[in-house]
């Protein structure tokens, strides 16, 4: 029987910069029941606080609700693991909420085949940013990525759309049914999950284009 091993806070995520959650990995348990507590202070403070919510994020997590979340101040936190034989502490972790945002997937993905008379046909898609993300403030830039594939294909074809919320793809296989998805990330944050797949049937008379794709 031994004191617990050193835990590690390995992940922090915020869906919208208004709340966030951090998760830790326990070290070895030393063969005894182990209690974990997360303590933190914000930059400019010396007063230590205990995690406000150990439940919402699931096991080995700490959730900071709206009243505990500030974008303006860096959080300094550590986890203490304690059993009957002693304690161990994680390394200190510094968290700036700006840099841990993982948004929800983009919304309202619509996909259409466009067949202008004077030009080659193309696949046109558009989407909306996730509702929880406030883009009006200006500091929050979302980047988008699209992936698509024929229904029975194994490999996805991926396109980076930058900050655009619409996109054209010119090179597709006629007669195929395609799955299309989009995801987003803030410049210094994390990719969202992929949006639900949207299906589109490419007409058999769709003319393959020499050029691959381009931004709208």
């Amino acid at each position: 029987q031994l004191p617990p091993g050193k835990p590690e806070i390995f992940k922090c995520r915020s869906p919208n910069k208004e709340t966030f959650t951090c998760w830790w990995r326990p070290g070895t348990d030393g063969g005894l029941p182990t209690n974990y507590s997360l303590t933190y202070h914000r930059e400019g403070e010396t007063l230590m606080h205990e995690c406000p919510d150990y439940i919402t994020g699931g096991p080995n997590s700490c959730h900071f609700g709206k009243q505990y979340t500030s974008m303006w101040r860096t959080y300094v936190m550590m986890v203490n693991a304690t059993n009957q034989m002693g304690s161990s502490f994680s390394d200190e972790l510094y968290v700036d909420v700006t840099y841990i945002v993982q948004p929800d997937p983009p919304l309202e993905l619509t996909v259409e085949v466009k067949q202008p008379e004077d030009r080659k046909p193309y696949l046109w898609m558009k989407w909306s940013p996730p509702t929880l993300i406030d883009l009006k403030t200006g500091w929050f830039t979302l980047l988008y990525e699209i992936r698509l594939k024929p229904e029975k294909a194994a490999e996805w074809e991926t396109h980076f759309a930058g900050q655009q919320t619409e996109f054209k793809i010119l090179s597709l296989h006629p007669g195929q049914k395609y799955l299309v998805q989009v995801r987003c990330k803030p410049d210094h944050g994390y990719w969202s999950a992929w949006s639900p797949a949207t299906f589109i049937q490419i007409p058999s008379d769709f003319i393959m284009n020499d050029h691959h794709h381009h931004h709208h």
């Epitope: 922090c12 972790l93 968290v95 700036d96 929050f140 990330k185």
Partner: antibody, heavy 118, light 112 residues
């Protein structure tokens, strides 16, 4: 203990490429961005770019875009910085550095001296 | 790119005396999220840089309280209240508000 251990010194010819490695230990490699900074002899510090090891997303200093390539190997917890079309002005110590969930550099590698000489 | 200008270029200080380093940026370092990402690093002779102060005025873990940072907008200062022999090296200010991140030219601190 967090450690960033870099590869050894290199001497390269002008026009060639160099690939510097940075092996991370003591933490979950995919959690934090890795940055690359260089320091020419007797000079200040210059930021080359950054990479998120979780998905290999990169941001580069425009000055190095097209010449510097940042990559990671998650299986060995190693980050790489490759610089191509080397010239004498690229002679410098190259550092990798790690952030937290922040945008400043909390841990630094020991540095790798790259000398470009004909 | 944001230009960071440090003064003085070098500083020779008697142990126990204060020292002050100034850093000026060519544009405001207030991020659109409201934070000011101005940091100070020390590079001791023969070593890699080490973080002293983050976000203008916050001492990093293990940094002695004789180091303090202040300033706002474009003008920032690092103060050492009582210089010790172990404080010798080159001090750099750095901004990470705007990409590319940039550093000042450095201030060399020596002991008299």
């Amino acid at each position: 203990e967090v450690q960033l251990v870099q590869s050894g010194a290199e001497v390269k010819k002008p026009g060639s490429s160099v690939k510097v490695s940075c092996k991370a230990s003591g933490y979950t490699f995919t959690s934090y961005w890795i940055h690359w900074v260089r320091q020419a002899p007797g000079q200040g510090l210059e930021w080359i770019g950054e990479i998120d090891p979780s998905d290999s997303y990169t941001n580069y200093n425009q000055k190095f875009k097209g010449r510097a390539t940042l990559t990671v190997d998650k299986s060995s917890s190693t980050a790489y910085m490759e610089l191509s079309s080397l010239r004498s002005e690229d002679t410098a110590v190259y550092y990798c550095a790690r952030s937290f969930f922040t945008n400043w550099f909390a841990y630094w590698g020991q540095g790798t001296l790259v000398t470009v000489s004909s | 790119d944001i230009v960071m200008t440090q003064t003085p270029l070098s500083l020779s200080v008697t142990p126990g005396q204060p020292a002050s380093i100034s850093c000026r940026s060519s544009q405001s370092l207030v991020h659109s999220n409201g934070n000011t990402y101005l940091h100070w690093y020390l590079q001791k002779p023969g070593q890699s840089p080490q973080l002293l102060i983050y976000k203008v005025s916050n001492r990093f873990s293990g940094v002695p309280d004789r180091f303090s940072g202040s300033g706002s907008g474009t003008d920032f200062t690092l103060k050492i209240s009582r210089v010790e022999a172990e404080d010798v090296g080159v001090y750099y200010c750095s901004q990470s508000t705007h990409v590319p991140f940039t550093f000042g030219g450095g201030t060399k601190v020596e002991i008299k």
